[in-house]
Amino acid sequence: GQNITARIGEPLVLSCKGAPKKPPQQLEWKLNTGRTEAWKVLSPQGGPWDSVARILPNGSLLLPATGIVDEGTFRCRATNRRGKEVKSNYRVRVYQIPGKPEIVDPASELTASVPNKVGTCVSEGSYPAGTLSWHLDGKLLIPDGKETLVKEETRRHPETGLFTLRSELTVIPTQGGTHPTFSCSFSLGLPRRRPLNTAPIQLRVREPGPPEGIQLLVEPEGGIVAPGGTVTLTCAISAQPPPQVHWIKDGAPLPLAPSPVLLLPEVGHEDEGTYSCVATHPSHGPQESPPVSIRVTETGDEGPAEGSVGESGLGTLA
């Protein structure tokens, strides 16, 4: 049999070998496709199937606009002028070239030694699904699961049957000061079809700088709270990626999961003390915040700390 590749929406003509070019003709076309459950023999007189597969006067079969459901096998059996039976067999596959792939949400720059999302490559409207590949400085990037990570997603449109592909690239650049160029290409995997390429993106790789200072914010302001109240400590740090934050009370680490926020609900005197946070950056080691003091006092023991307000939002009078 012969393999035929047809573009979705385009007409396709399959010739019936051996068939006389004009009637009278003895021929039979049958098909087994996504529109049939078994073999369907087409009526030479034509009929409801003519909209998808019609026998032409010369014996050829016309598919006016091939679709995904037309993939399958087409066979013609004809008797030639000398009375010999001639068979034709076609295996039809269809394809659709998507729009040019695009890199969406591209990074503005990369940081050395840490994972960075480069961007997401998107291709819409392909059939069959095809594949997306990433390139670094013109060379194919092979994901290794460590320094180069690719997260892929394929979706099929419920009505058209066409595919949308998404590929998210994350890399860990080894050193700063370089300017790598990333691009993405889509390939249908069909012979004689060149891949479609995105516009390349060139990114600067910077060395990870030390965090620009670390601040410990306390709520209520001043760190003075009545028994049963709530204290919120927030470790504010401007570093990318966000570091792990641990907490220290009176010089001893608190056995808590890393978090930039420490919540002390229903405080009692046992919660009094000096608190600080420690930010651990992958490439810069730990950095500790200035400490803050938490005091638990009955309302009225002392006036409110300077700048603090009562619950009503007004200063309280002893």
């Epitope: 529109r35 459950e37 007189q45 034509g46 009929g47 409801p48 199937w49 003519d50 909209s51 998808v52």
Partner: antibody, heavy 119, light 107 residues
């Protein structure tokens, strides 16, 4: 909203001719095959004619072949049925319907127009 | 030509009943069968397309099934507005052929 409106029915004598029209709206007319179906008083439905979306190919059952001609004007979104040599057994309500091929079957129908053939 | 033998030709049922109508094709027509509902003086309305698919705006109490050349329309719980005549249609071959119809009447 898909709409099909038939016109042209009436009382005619056996042997005479009549032309039915169907005005289509609410869809891309030239994307669809179109079909005429009839229903004799108190009887079931009977296929009369179909035409492909371009108008190049027409299809009829033996009962009307050579007497009826289906045609269309895609520029006017209109379907026609020219009925010649009318017989008493052609008396029926004639419906215009969208489709007629395997991709659609028959999905939307007009309200019909009555053709009475009687002397 | 293909024959579509529809049964029963009429039936009496009560509101809430489950109703089943069958069409048998004289040869293989694949999935290319529609079901229609027709009320007196009105045009047919498509209920089911390609044997098993519910048409837009049709209540889910209607369903279509197929076993080889046997096609079935089921109304799971008959409603007052469902009393009408029902037809099947094969559109796999010309001539397009309708079943003879089933009139569903109030018991």
């Amino acid at each position: 909203e898909v709409q099909l409106v038939e016109s042209g029915g009436g009382l005619v004598q056996p042997g005479s001719s009549l032309r039915l029209s169907c005005a289509a709206s609410g869809f891309t007319f030239n994307n669809y095959w179109m079909t005429w179906v009839r229903q004799a008083p108190g009887k079931g439905l009977e296929w009369v004619a179909s035409i492909d979306n371009s108008g190049d190919n027409t299809y009829y059952p033996d009962s009307v072949k050579d007497r009826f001609t289906i045609s269309r004007d895609n520029a006017k979104n209109s379907l026609y049925l020219q009925m010649n040599s009318l017989r008493a057994e052609d008396t029926a309500v004639y419906y215009c319907a969208r489709g007629g091929d395997i991709t659609t079957g028959l999905d939307y129908w007009g309200q019909g127009t009555l053709v009475t053939v009687s002397s | 030509d293909i024959q579509m033998t529809q049964s029963p030709s009429s039936l009496s049922a009560s509101v809430g009943d489950r109703v089943t109508i069958t069409c048998r094709a004289s040869q293989d027509v694949g999935i290319y069968v529609n079901w229609f509902q027709q009320k007196p003086g009105k045009a047919p309305r498509r209920l089911i397309y390609r044997a098993t698919n519910l048409a837009d705006g049709v209540p889910s109490r209607f369903s279509g099934s197929r076993s080889g050349t046997d096609f079935t329309l089921t109304i799971s719980s008959l409603q007052p507005e469902d009393f009408a005549t029902y037809y099947c249609l094969e559109f796999d071959e010309h001539p397009l052929t309708f079943g003879g119809g089933t009139k569903v009447e109030i018991k």
